[in-house]
Each structure stands twice: as structure tokens, then as C-alpha cells.
Interface confidence: low
């Protein structure tokens, strides 16, 4: 895995950033956000963009505000594109963000992590030489 591509690095960074935010779930605005789950094949990138667009916000409760805001900013960074991502952008049959069940921040982050793990697994599976550990 030493020569892993930038896409994989970025997706794994996102997982750890989600884990980081889970530490501060009590400092997030407790509003309900669209949280895709059991995403159908070929709609992963559409669901990913729903997670990125969601209005996850710091509750401005003090010490943790800075790191929460930086984490949220990083979650919204555009990841390196892949062929699969480019293909999926043209699909019009994926559910709209508003059609997904809305969940509070804790469940929202858990579902986001689950989607990221699924996307990493798919990416690894699509590479005939890929393995999960170095």
C-alpha cells in the first residue's frame, strides 16, 4: 500500500476526520441531516455529495469550536476524481439528498463513515493487485 493513489489516501483521511468529529458530537448543532444508508450500487458518489452538502455545524460551545470547524471544512474538500466518480455524476436515477432519512449528527457521522468504508472496499476490489494492508 506504499504506493497507494491519492484517491485512496483522501478517502481514508475522510474516515479519520469523521472519527475525529464523532469525539465532538455533543458540540455539534443537534439538527437532523439527510443521511444516506444502504446506498444502491452506482449511487455512492451521489450519496457522498449529499453528506458533503449537509449543514453540519459547530454549536459554538467553546474550546472545541476551532477543531470542529476545521474538520468540517476538510470533510467538504473535493476528493480526487476517479473514473467511477465521473461516470456516476451523469446518473439521474439516484435519490435526491432530501429524499434520504434525516438523522442527528451522531448517526449522520456513522452513516457517512459506513459509506466511505464501502467506497474504499469497492475501490480496492476494482484493483486486481490491491490489498488492504501494506
Amino acid at each position: 500500500m506504499q504506493g497507494q493513489d491519492r484517491h485512496m489516501i483522501r478517502m481514508r483521511q475522510l474516515i479519520d476526520i469523521v472519527d475525529q468529529l464523532k469525539n465532538y458530537v455533543n458540540d455539534l448543532v443537534p439538527e437532523f441531516l439527510p443521511a444516506p444508508e444502504d446506498v444502491e450500487t452506482n449511487c455512492e458518489w451521489s450519496a457522498f455529495s449529499c453528506f458533503q452538502k449537509a449543514q453540519l455545524k459547530s454549536a459554538n460551545t467553546g474550546n472545541n469550536e476551532r477543531i470542529i470547524n476545521v474538520s468540517i471544512k476538510k470533510l467538504k474538500r473535493k476528493p480526487p476524481s476517479t473514473n467511477a466518480g465521473r461516470r456516476q455524476k451523469h446518473r439521474l436515477t439516484c435519490p435526491s439528498c432530501d429524499s434520504y432519512e434525516k438523522k442527528p449528527p451522531k448517526e449522520f457521522l456513522e452513516r457517512f463513515k459506513s459509506l466511505l468504508q464501502k467506497m474504499i472496499h469497492q475501490h480496492l476490489s476494482s484493483r486486481t493487485h490491491g490489498s488492504e494492508d501494506s
Partner: antibody, heavy 120, light 107 residues
């Protein structure tokens, strides 16, 4: 207080083995990637190994690959480094280090270090 | 492996001086770079993450800049407690690597 405390260092002969441990406290250990970083006497810092929060991804420096094994026990808030086939050049202070957000936040918590001396 | 080259290797300066340390990566590492300060016999302490984000509790006289391959750590006005060794580290890809260090000494 967020804290990392290493143990297990000592004097060992070339070819011997040691197991370093790191006890974490004051934070949710299971949410963080962890690393071992070493520093030979009078030298700079050298990254040794990393393990992600759920032990899903593990990486090693070329200099230790095949000889060292990193592991963690989230239930015990502990990180380990099993070091086999030790060489004189492995002599160093070994630091247990917490990593945030795949490095975008850097390595923010360091232990005090444990000294490993490999000598006949 | 990505190589990080710090310059200068050592530097003599006086209290109140403005000091700049550079770190050059052998390939593009985006902003995945941190800076650390280490004093003799102590563990390193993080100063800057994500190339330019100041770590909580670190004095504002420290600042980081850069992206891609060229990075800079600046101390705007040296204080007595700033004399130490400084390291950069990249997190863009494995193996993670450190620069060789810059020793900042009192002139």
C-alpha cells in the same frame, strides 16, 4: 489529562527481541490512529510504524519491515510494538504518538519515550 | 519515499529576531505537513498542522505557510524559550517522513 506512557525499553543483544507498550489515557483511544516514532542518540526523528483506529491499515518504515509488528488493544487503551531481530541501528528512544485526521492535524500527543539499546 | 529537506541545518539568532526555516518536499504533498519543536531530552511538541494551522496553545509568533513542495515556518520575534530543534513532517503518503531538523541556537 491526555497522556501516553511507554514502557518495555531496555538493553538487548543484537538478534534479540523486545516488546514495547504504550498506555493511553484521557481520550477516546479507539478513535485515533497511533504511531511509533524513534530517535537515535544525537540524530533526528524517524517514523517507524502506524496503525489506524480499528487496526485496519498498518504501515512500516522500510528499515523495520519484516522485523517489527505494531498492534493495539482498544479495550485496554494500549499500543504495542513487537521488535524482533534487533540491530545496533535500532538503538533509539521510542515514542508512542497520537495522530489526528490522517495527519492533517499532525501528531499532537507524544509520550515521554522509552530507551532501547541494542549492544553486545 | 518522499524526502523532506530542511534549511538551514543550523541557525544562530538573537532574541527578537525574525527567523524563517524552510522545508522542501521531493514531490507534491498538498498541505499535509506539520512542524514540531523539540528541546533536549524532551519529546517533540506540535506547532503547526495542515501546513499553516496554528496548534491550540502555541504562541501566535509562530506561523506556517506553503503548499505543494515548498513550506516555511516563521518565528516573528524570537523568545528565549524558542531556542530548540525544529522538524517538518509529511503525511501525504506512507512512509511518513521527517526533515533532518534545524537547530536554532542563541547568537
Amino acid at each position: 489529562e491526555v497522556q501516553l506512557v511507554e514502557s518495555g525499553g531496555g538493553l538487548v543483544k543484537p538478534g534479540g527481541s523486545l516488546r514495547l507498550s504504550c498506555a493511553a489515557s484521557g481520550f477516546i483511544f479507539s478513535s485515533y490512529s497511533m504511531n511509533w516514532v524513534r530517535q537515535a542518540p544525537g540524530k533526528g526523528l524517524e517514523w517507524v510504524s502506524s496503525i489506524t483506529s480499528g487496526s485496519y491499515y498498518i504501515h512500516y518504515a522500510e528499515s523495520v519491515k519484516g522485523r517489527f509488528t505494531i498492534s493495539r488493544d482498544n479495550a485496554k487503551n494500549s499500543l504495542y510494538l513487537q521488535m524482533n531481530s534487533l540491530r545496533a541501528e535500532d538503538t533509539a528512544v521510542y515514542y508512542c504518538v497520537r495522530e489526528r485526521g490522517w495527519g492533517y492535524y499532525g501528531m499532537d500527543v507524544w509520550g515521554q519515550g522509552t530507551t532501547v539499546t541494542v549492544s553486545s | 519515499a518522499i524526502q523532506l529537506t530542511q534549511s538551514p541545518s543550523s541557525l544562530s539568532a538573537s532574541v527578537g529576531d525574525r527567523v524563517t526555516i524552510t522545508c522542501r518536499a521531493s514531490q507534491d504533498i498538498d498541505s499535509a505537513l506539520a512542524w514540531y519543536q523539540q528541546k533536549p531530552g524532551k519529546a517533540p511538541k506540535i506547532l503547526i498542522h495542515d501546513a499553516s494551522s496554528l496548534e491550540s496553545g502555541v504562541p501566535s509568533r509562530f506561523s506556517g505557510s506553503g503548499s505543494g513542495t515548498d513550506f516555511t515556518l516563521t518565528i516573528s520575534s524570537l523568545q528565549p524559550e524558542d531556542f530548540a530543534t525544529y522538524y517538518c513532517q509529511q503525511f501525504n503518503s506512507y512512509p511518513y517522513t521527517f526533515g533532518q531538523g534545524t537547530k536554532l541556537e542563541i547568537k
